[in-house]
Interface confidence: low
């Protein structure tokens, strides 16, 4: 049935799924408040603007009943049953706002028409990658293998002298969404990643990765993974490592490292810590006070879902353009917009770009400090620490085959 | 029309606190960034730090220990506290809207402030 | 650091006459948080260009800028009495948040 947009005559409407399953266990209480802490934020911003138009959310709950896992496994059916219940109810805004989990996104994505612009807290997927209505404000998975390929490939830095073209990846199935689908890219043999490294091996049991740190007949001396240096050490413990052993941490919605008063423990000495820039400053608002440092990145990915929803609206409404066409939904791209915490960009197919950051652990003073940053937008490695105290010999990164270390 | 107005002394001794208030009018404070900016006699401009919704902050790493902004959304008015003020401090204050896609489109007029004993 | 160099320190020319503003990045700025401005004597700096070329409410058309990168420029195609002052670049988004350039006087010849 046709679903009716609430969407003109000076009234706009957000649908913001509120989604039983979702990629991060918050209280769907503290999103309601990112989502209406943004409102006002956009109010104002129109209001500024001359522009006497009324902006609302419509808050869509799922019953959940049937899909009551909390995480992504079930996610497929609920974001589908919330779509129904929107063609029930022949009411859909201007905007769909929530789907966070990739299988649902993926899902929604294909089983329905969307002329109207939808926006995800997640999806990190590679199947929700190229989507033309679809608009992704927490970093996918595409943005962390371009990193990883640039990284490998870089050889003309002081502290990396060596192309690298091997990598362990472990991978246990009990991660978060977000690693879940970071590794998930970093496997699959038709991505990015695996085209332009010549080996890559899985690792699947902690065994297999507890061997591996000493194991002298290795295929590679660098290991992925993903999580904090809790799940790191919960694996690794206080075993010894090889010295030419390079752990790649991905961690990227963890602002803990940039903490003042935060030491690095010491098994984080072989580790590289890939994280996110932090924002202007840590947030302190009414939505998250009481926030880890992930799910503040989420929430505050549902606020900027607002702000960018209020940016596009804005200037539709003052170029006299109708907010009901595919102009509309598909224009979700290929901008910079006032977010919450900083200007936010999007790419040309509606992903958020970032700075990525690349951190060590300082022999000297056991502080995490930043090794390089990496612009997703350009694609381009901007090296920071140009005599970085390492634990590695030299104070360079090694070779990335066994026994070929720093010449 | 926006409007931006700097107060304060004008004269601060060595080793105290300079203070400063900018008062917005035409625009709400809470809708936007706001930042401090100042320039010494014949040289160039200096980003101090800015503030957004709920008091957060930012600031320019190399005053950063010196610094703090606030704000007082019932009066419209945000504030620069710089402490510890040396003769190196004397400048011309400027607060400005600062639009975080990296411009500022309103600004005050700007206040001097010499630190002399 | 970003360190934003303009050139020439000063530029002198007459009314009539095209200026041409430089400003070089110590490393590359996206062009989305470059902006100019203007200042006289006495005076609060004045927005001109924002992202690099978007002139700002009120800016006549003969200033207009262009870049990428680490270069950018700011060209006054016709210059009028009242263009002569002091011009600024600005990027944002690197540490420090925000940065400018030292300057360029534009006086008449």
């Known amino acids: 049935s046709q679903v009716s947009q609430n969407c003109h005559n000076g009234s706009y409407e957000i649908s913001v799924l509120m989604m039983g399953n979702s990629a991060f266990a918050e209280p769907l209480k503290n999103l309601e408040d990112a989502v209406n802490e943004g409102l006002e934020i956009v109010r104002g911003r129109l209001q500024n603007a001359g522009l006497n138009v009324t902006v609302n959310a419509t808050f869509m709950y799922s019953d959940g009943l049937i899909h009551n896992s909390g995480d992504c496994r079930s996610s497929t059916c609920e974001g589908l049953d919330l779509l129904r219940k929107i063609s029930n109810a022949q009411r859909m805004g201007c905007v769909l706002i929530g789907p966070s989990c990739t299988y649902s996104t993926f899902q929604m994505y294909l089983d329905t028409e969307l002329s109207y612009p939808m926006i995800s807290a997640g999806s990190f997927g590679l199947s929700c990658d190229y989507k033309e209505t679809l608009t992704r404000l927490m970093s996918p998975a595409r943005k962390l293998m371009y990193f990883l390929v640039n990284f490998w490939k870089t050889n003309d830095l002081p502290f990396k002298t060596y192309s690298w073209s091997t990598s362990y990846v472990y991978k246990n199935g009990t991660e978060t969404e977000d690693c879940f689908w970071y590794l998930n890219a970093l496997e699959a043999s038709v991505s990015y990643f695996s085209h332009e490294l010549g080996f890559k091996v899985v690792l699947r049991q902690d065994k297999e990765f507890q061997d591996i740190l000493m194991d002298h007949n290795r295929k590679s001396n660098v290991i992925i993974m993903c999580g904090g240096p809790e799940f790191l050490y919960k694996l690794k413990g206080d075993r010894a490592v090889a010295e030419d052993i390079v752990i790649i941490l991905v961690d990227l919605f963890n602002d803990q490292y940039f903490e003042d008063n935060v030491t690095a423990p010491d098994y984080m000495k072989n580790v590289l810590v890939l994280t996110l820039s932090p924002g202007n400053s840590l947030l302190n608002s009414s939505f998250s006070r009481n926030l880890s440092p992930t799910k503040r990145d989420f929430a505050l990915a549902y606020l900027n879902g607002i702000l960018l929803f209020g940016h596009m609206l804005k200037i539709f409404l003052e170029n006299g353009e109708n907010i009901t066409t595919p102009k509309f939904a598909h224009a979700f791209r290929n901008l910079t917009f006032e977010g919450y915490d900083g200007p936010v960009t999007l790419d040309d197919w509606g992903d958020v770009d970032s700075t990525m950051v690349l951190l060590y652990t300082s022999v000297d003073t056991k502080k995490y400090k930043v090794l390089l940053t990496y612009d997703t937008h350009v694609n381009k490695t901007y090296p920071v620490d140009m005599s970085p105290t390492f634990t590695w010999k030299n104070s360079k990164l090694p070779n990335d085959i066994t026994g070929r270390g720093p010449q | 029309q926006v409007q931006l107005q700097e107060s304060g002394p004008g004269l601060v001794k060595p080793s105290e606190t300079l203070s400063l208030t900018c008062t917005v009018s035409g625009a709400s404070i809470s809708h936007y960034y706001w930042s401090w900016i100042r320039q010494p006699a014949g040289k160039g401009l200096e980003w101090i730090g800015r503030?957004?919704?709920?008091?957060?902050?930012s600031y320019n790493p190399s005053l950063k220990s010196r610094v703090t902004v606030s704000v007082d959304t019932s009066k419209n008015q945000f504030s620069l506290k710089l402490s510890s003020v040396t003769a190196a401090d004397t400048a011309v204050y400027y607060c400005?809207?600062?639009?975080?896609?990296?411009?500022?489109?309103?600004w005050g007029q700007g206040t001097l402030v010499t630190v002399s004993s | 650091e970003i360190v934003l160099t303009q050139s020439p320190g000063t530029l002198s020319l007459s009314p009539g006459e095209r200026a041409t503003l430089s400003c070089r990045a110590s490393q590359s700025v996206s062009s989305s948080y470059l902006a100019w401005y203007q200042q006289k004597p006495g005076q609060a700096p004045r927005l001109l260009i924002y992202?690099?070329?978007s002139r700002a409410t009120g800016i006549p058309d003969r200033f207009s800028g262009s870049g990428s990168g680490t270069d950018f420029t700011l060209t006054i195609s016709r210059l009028e009495p009242e263009d002569f002052a002091v011009y600024y670049c600005q990027q944002y988004g690197s540490s420090p948040m925000c940065s400018f350039g030292q300057g360029t006087k534009l006086e008449i010849k």
């Open positions: 503030i957004y919704i709920s008091g957060r902050t």
């Open positions: 400005a809207r600062d639009r975080l896609t990296g411009y500022f489109d309103y």
């Open positions: 992202g690099t070329s």
